[in-house]
Amino acid sequence: QLPPGKPEIFKCRSPNKETFTCWWRPGTDGGLPTNYSLTYHREGETLMHECPDYITGGPNSCHFGKQYTSMWRTYIMMVNATNQMGSSFSDELYVDVTYIVQPDPPLELAVEVKQPEDRKPYLWIKWSPPTLIDLKTGWFTLLYEIRLKPEKAAEWEIHFAGQQTEFKILSLHPGQKYLVQVRCKPDHGYWSAWSPATFIQIPSDFTMND
């Protein structure tokens, strides 16, 4: 029977800068029941606070609701593991909520084959930003990535769309059914999951780009 091993806070994520959750990995339990607590303070403060919500994020997590979440202030947090034989502390983790946003996937993905008379045909892809993200304030810049592939193909073709919410693709295989998905990330933050796939049938008379 031993004191617990050192835990590690390994991930923090926010869907929208208004709330966030951090998760830790326990160390070894030393063969005894072990209790974990997360404490934190904000930069410039000395007053320590305990995690406000150990439930919402699941096991080994701490959730910070709206009233506990401040943008532009660094949180300094650590996890304490305690059993009958002693305690151990994680390294301190410095967290700025602005930098840990992982948005929901983009919405309203629409895909259409365009065949203008005077130009090459192309695939036109359009989407909307996720609803929880407020782009109007200027706090967020969202970047987008598209992936597509013929239905039976193994490899995805990836296109970086920057900040735009529509994109044209010229080189496609005529007669194939394509899957198209889009994802987004803040300029500092994490990629969302891919949106649900949209299927599009490319006409047999679609002319490949030279």
């Epitope: 590690e8 991930k11 967290v95 930098y99 500092h188």
Partner: antibody, heavy 120, light 107 residues
Framework: EVQLVQSGAEVKKPGSSVKVSCKAS????????MHWVRQAPGQGLEWMGE????????NYNQKFKDRVTITADKSTSTAYMELSSLRSEDTAVYYC?????????????WGQGTLVTVSS | EIVMTQSPATLSVSPGERATLSCKAS??????VAWYQQKPGQAPRLLIY???NRYTGIPARFSGSGSGTEFTLTISSLQSEDFAVYYC?????????FGGGTKVEIK
């Protein structure tokens, strides 16, 4: 204990490439951005670029954009910096540096440095 | 890019005295400034982040101040181990940039 251990010194010819490695231990590699900073002999520090090892998303100093490639191998917790088309003024100590937290780019842990000498 | 200008280039101070190092940014950077200490043959060591926050384990004699474009690192009472080169760094906008350094030497 957090450690960043870099590969050994290199001597390279002008026009060639160099690839410096930085093996991380003591923390979860994918949690923090990794940066590369260089220091020419007797000179100051110059940021070259950064990578998020969780998805290999990277940003570069435009000064090096066409010559530098930063990669990360999650399976070995190792970051790499490759600099191509070397010239004599690339002679420097190259450091990897871990982001201080989940936040802006200040650097709390540094590798020991790798001296790259470019000479004909 | 944002240019960080440090002054003086060299500062001669006696042990036990106060040292005041200056760093000026060519554009507004808010409080997105860090300070590092570097000794010969060693990697830099983080002292201060967000202009005024001491990093974990850094002695209280090191303090940072300033916002906007003008920043100061103060070492209240220099110890023998504090003689080194000090760099400021901005992380307000890409590319992240460092000042040219201030060498603090024994008077």
């Amino acid at each position: 204990e957090v450690q960043l251990v870099q590969s050994g010194a290199e001597v390279k010819k002008p026009g060639s490439s160099v690839k410096v490695s930085c093996k991380a231990s003591g923390y979860t590699f994918t949690t923090y951005w990794m940066h590369w900073v260089r220091q020419a002999p007797g000179q100051g520090l110059e940021w070259m670029g950064e990578i998020d090892p969780s998805d290999s998303y990277s940003n570069y100093n435009q000064k090096f954009k066409d010559r530098v490639t930063i990669t990360a191998d999650k399976s070995t917790s190792t970051a790499y910096m490759e600099l191509s088309s070397l010239r004599s003024e690339d002679t420097a100590v190259y450091y990897c540096a871990r982001n201080g937290g989940l936040g802006p780019a200040w650097f709390s842990y540094w590798g020991q440095g790798t001296l790259v000498t470019v000479s004909s | 890019e944002i240019v960080m200008t440090q002054s003086p280039a060299t500062l001669s101070v006696s042990p036990g005295e106060r040292a005041t190092l200056s760093c000026k940014a060519s554009q507004y950077v808010g409080t997105a400034v860090a300070w590092y200490q570097q000794k010969p043959g060693q990697a830099p060591r983080l002292l201060i982040y967000s202009a005024s926050n001491r990093y974990t384990g850094i002695p209280a004699r090191f303090s940072g101040s300033g916002s906007g474009t003008e920043f100061t690192l103060t070492i209240s009472s220099l110890q023998s181990e504090d003689f080194a080169v000090y760099y400021c760094q901005q992380y307000s906008s890409y590319p992240w940039t460092f000042g040219g350094g201030t060498k603090v030497e024994i008077k």
